[in-house]
């Protein structure tokens, strides 16, 4: 795995995937904090498969966005604000 | 010529999941990134996922992060798009498209139709 150094920190970038000449389109990209600590005693108690340590952490996303019409006639989201904020995760 | 196909949609219930599939032939698979786009009745098309030829590097739409994954196979020139937690909202025709780094998005595959209903 990369050195966390390596990461650049949450920020907007050119989107490489839709961005044209003259006409970048911005998307969030980049690291935010994690964090990892014993679990407290009490949160254990409520656990159906007790784990030893809780992890923390959170994604860069879009805090505001326009939807925007690109050359092919789609539309997709140019960033406008970034923020770190709650990771969702789904089992496949 | 470059030929796309898509498979793997169908009929799902309201948080039901499904994975599509994008076979590409006639290219150098390596030298593209693959995109998945979707277009409802009477919607705009709209990118909903994209990845870059190593994978490491993506895009989602925001309606959609944390619940598709775009991932490929460049060993059997396939992309996938894991779609979990499916909404009614979700049901569009699904196309896989390429594009070149130094070019645009001008292969599209027929589509495959996603229909999210109880």
């Known amino acids: 795995a990369p050195d966390v150094q390596d990461c650049p920190e949450c920020t907007l970038q050119e989107n490489p995937f839709f961005s044209q000449p003259g006409a970048p389109i911005l998307q969030c990209m980049g690291c935010c904090f994690s964090r990892a600590y014993p679990t407290p005693l009490r949160s254990k108690k409520t656990m159906l498969v007790q784990k030893n340590v809780t992890s923390e952490s959170t994604c860069c996303v879009a805090k505001s966005y326009n939807r925007v019409t690109v050359m092919g006639g789609f539309k997709v989201e140019n960033h406008t604000a970034c923020h770190c904020s709650t990771c969702y995760y789904h089992k496949s | 010529q470059v030929q796309l196909q898509e498979s793997g949609g169908e009929l799902v219930q309201p948080g039901g999941s499904l994975k599509l599939s994008c076979a590409a032939s006639?290219?150098?698979?390596?030298?593209?990134?693959m995109g998945w786009f979707r277009q409802a009745p009477g919607v705009d098309r709209e990118a909903v996922a994209a990845?870059?030829?190593?994978?490491?590097?993506?895009y989602y739409v925001s309606s959609v992060k944390g619940r598709f994954t775009i991932s490929r196979d460049n060993a059997k020139n396939t992309v996938y798009l894991q779609m979990n937690s499916l909404k009614p909202q979700d049901t569009a025709v699904y196309y896989c498209?390429?594009?070149?780094?130094?070019?645009?998005?001008?292969?599209w595959g027929q589509g495959t139709q996603v229909t999210v209903s109880s």
């Open positions: 006639g290219l150098t698979f390596t030298n593209y990134s």
């Open positions: 498209a390429v594009k070149p780094d130094d070019g645009w998005w001008d292969y």
């Open positions: 990845i870059s030829w190593s994978g490491d590097n993506t």
